[in-house]
Interface confidence: low
């Protein structure tokens, strides 16, 4: 058993046949010594008396809010949550496996630049009685600070018969060094509590591996005289790291016909302009990627040829 | 070239060669995302590699103030990786394919380090750790880790030279 936060405790249980469970001793936070009784949740049934209560925690029925009273007055509470190890594996029931980039990916994170700011998100089908708390650090043995905000519900989607809820959190490395080569990964730890079930999820990454620039901005076309060619120009996204002479991007320019089956023409360039042939009813799209490290491409920015 | 007394390197040449190094490092080990190397207990293998750290003056401001600290750090790393790529880790079994980019990568590391330091002038270089994996699979894993680490190192070096070429070239 360990303390998650004040008056909230996590009991780690081997979810096993005939498992004896964990013996837990609760102590009433009071100077009083006698006349103390204990109850669980909303029940008025007295579970025991005295300053301490010893219980055997085996199932969810044994978890919940234990309260000690004296003469009708509440003295203190202890909330017991269960963390299940089922058939040798810690349970991961609360979050959905996103399966990208590999199986057992529950947390996904992205950064728009090298400033040390990143966003993580996760999915669940649970709509109520759900809380998350997020901690992060750079490295684990001698951790350096990363500050995370509160996790918030960022999207709701309908998937078949199910509703899916996306939660996200923003974090910022306290003393980020955008130009340095990372040697210690960022660690992100999410505590999830659904009703009386506790689970924890972790992710470890370098910022450089989760970089995904915003799409290029101000995408414009300039027809070239007496030609089917156009000059496409764009700018670095506002959110990208500066100076651009140091934090450089490379770009992919694509001409795509109306039909998805039509051949796509692609040009790669380090410049912020390119000359392409604009076909009727086609559109021109540009996306960006770090020039020197192959992290994710941005989403496309697009304009119609007409 | 970075010569004694600290005059400027050939920023544009360094820029071109470092960008080529980035391309080669990724073509030598493109499937980075398919293996989470941090799960493979790499403390004893790639912790000794020289990283370009915050105080090494490789940020735009540090380069403007005095690029020598940063260039020395980059040179150190280039020599380190050049030695690793020429070691038993890459020359031993399982043999690299004849068209593997590792050979080109090795030569380009040497080329860039020589651009930074001509004969007769010696910056202090870091000792290469004695890594001699006993099993072919260990060697394969070590190659992946070294190339992964090299990708991060040359990305920073390429940024340095690109910025230098754009803002510090005479």
């Amino acid at each position: 058993i360990w303390e998650l936060k004040k008056d909230v405790y996590v009991v780690e249980l081997d979810w096993y046949p005939d498992a004896p469970g964990e013996m837990v001793v609760l102590t009433c936070d009071t100077p009083e010594e006698d006349g103390i009784t204990w109850t669980l949740d909303q029940s008025s049934e007295v579970l025991g008396s005295g300053k301490t209560l010893t219980i055997q925690v085996k199932e969810f029925g044994d978890a919940g809010q234990y309260t000690c009273h004296k003469g009708g007055e509440v003295l203190s509470h202890s909330l017991l949550l269960l963390h299940k190890k089922e058939d040798g594996i810690w349970s991961t029931d609360i979050l959905k496996d996103q399966k990208e980039p590999k199986n057992k990916t529950f947390l996904r994170c992205e950064a728009k630049n090298y400033s040390g700011r990143f966003t993580c998100w996760w999915l669940t089908t649970i709509s109520t009685d759900l809380t998350f708390s997020v901690k992060s650090s750079r490295g684990s043995s001698d951790p350096q600070g990363v500050t995370c905000g509160a996790a918030t519900l960022s999207a709701e989607r309908v998937r078949g018969d199910n509703k899916e809820y996306e939660y996200s959190v923003e974090c910022q490395e306290d003393s980020a060094c955008p130009a340095a080569e990372e040697s210690l990964p960022i660690e992100v730890m999410v505590d999830a509590v659904h009703k009386l079930k506790y689970e924890n999820y972790t992710s470890s990454f370098f910022i450089r591996d989760i970089i995904k620039p915003d799409p290029p901005k101000n995408l414009q076309l300039k027809p070239l005289k007496n030609s089917r060619q156009v000059e496409v120009s764009w700018e670095y996204p506002d959110t990208w790291s500066t100076p651009h002479s140091y934090f450089s991007l490379t770009f992919c320019v694509q001409v795509q016909g109306k039909s998805k089956r039509e051949k796509k023409d692609r040009v790669f360039t380090d410049k912020t302009s390119a000359t392409v042939i604009c076909r009727k009813n086609a559109s021109i799209s540009v996306r960006a990627q770090d020039r020197y490290y192959s992290s994710s491409w941005s989403e496309w920015a697009s304009v119609p040829c007409s | 070239r970075a010569v004694p007394g600290g005059s400027s390197p050939a920023w544009t040449q360094c820029q071109q060669l470092s960008q080529k190094l980035c391309t080669l490092a990724w073509s030598a080990h493109p499937l980075v995302g398919h293996m989470d190397l941090r799960e493979e207990g790499d403390e004893e293998t790639t912790n000794d590699v020289p990283h370009i750290q915050c105080g090494d003056g490789c940020d735009p401001q540090g380069l403007r103030d005095n690029s020598q600290f940063c260039l020395q750090r980059i040179h150190q790393g280039l020599i380190f990786y050049e030695k690793l790529l020429g070691s038993d880790i890459f020359t031993g079994e399982p043999s690299l394919l004849p068209d593997s980019p590792v050979g080109q990568l090795h030569a380009s590391l040497l080329g860039l380090s020589q651009l930074l330091q001509p004969e007769g002038h010696h910056w202090e270089t870091q000792q290469i750790p004695s890594l001699s994996p006993s099993q072919p699979w260990q060697r394969l894993l070590l190659r992946f880790k070294i190339l992964r680490s090299l990708q991060a190192f040359v990305a920073v070096a390429a940024r340095v030279f690109a910025h230098g070429a754009a803002t510090l070239s005479p």
Partner: antibody, heavy 114, light 112 residues
Framework: EFQLVQSGAEVKKPGASVKVSCKAS????????MNWVRQAPGQSLEWMGV????????TYNQKFKGRVTITVDQSASTAYMELSSLRSEDTAVYYC???????WGQGTLVTVSS | DIVMTQTPLSLPVTPGEPASISCRSS???????????LNWFLQKPGQSPQLLIY???TRASGVPDRFSGSGSGTDLTLKISRVEAEDVGVYYC?????????FGSGTKLEIK
């Protein structure tokens, strides 16, 4: 008292599907994972997969490559195992077993024959 | 997948005598938490398997104390101190350290 009661024997043609049920009683159905295990005549036991009845999350033995689907009906406290594209080597007794494998159903014989 | 190799295939025993069944795992079943994730089952003719031992050495409820489990992370043993006529059947070991869970091929215990 804990009980797992399975559906009756089935005879199926190759290529068909079979759906075996397992009704749980005597405990909180959603609190415990449900495993499915099969045993071909004279052979050892083979684990097929597991479901968490509370959330519907499943883990399958890759050997069955998409042929097996495990589901639950919480309101009926029943777990189901469906096996598709049946072949003769799928002839076996199919068991459900509660988390930890302390409690087993009585088994359901599925015979695949043309 | 973890392979469980069980020996012997057949075990004829005289009532009152001890018996020992061995199970070798291709990968350690000992977790960082100090527990070894191995089960032993007995399947009597025409019945479902019944759990005898879990976590390598803990007897399931109602299992007589003549049954005991021991071993290391990879070499596991089930011992019966004095075999009785009701102990006949096929004994299986099973790992639940990682998915997919796998069983040994079985050991048939018969009375001499």
């Amino acid at each position: 008292e804990f009980q797992l009661v399975q559906s009756g024997a089935e005879v199926k043609k190759p290529g068909a599907s079979v759906k075996v049920s397992c009704k749980a009683s005597g405990y909180s159905f959603t609190d415990h994972n449900m495993n499915w295990v099969r045993q071909a005549p004279g052979q050892s036991l083979e684990w097929m997969g597991v479901i968490n009845p509370n959330y519907g999350t499943t883990t399958y033995n890759q050997k069955f490559k998409g042929r097996v689907t495990i589901t639950v009906d919480q309101s009926a406290s029943t777990a189901y195992m469906e096996l598709s594209s049946l072949r003769s080597e799928d002839t076996a007794v199919y068991y459900c077993a509660r988390r930890g494998f302390a409690y087993w159903g009585q088994g359901t014989l599925v015979t695949v024959s043309s | 997948d973890i392979v469980m190799t069980q020996t012997p295939l057949s075990l004829p025993v005289t009532p009152g005598e001890p018996a020992s069944i061995s199970c070798r795992s291709s990968k350690s079943l000992l977790y960082k938490d100090g527990k070894t994730y191995l089960n032993w089952f007995l399947q009597k003719p025409g019945q479902s398997p019944q759990l005898l031992i879990y976590l390598m050495q803990t007897r399931a409820s109602g299992v007589p104390d003549r049954f005991s489990g021991s071993g290391s992370g990879t070499d596991l043993t089930l011992k019966i101190s004095r075999v009785e006529a009701e102990d006949v059947g096929v004994y299986y070991c099973q790992q639940i350290a990682e998915y997919p869970f796998t069983f040994g091929s079985g050991t048939k215990l018969e009375i001499k």
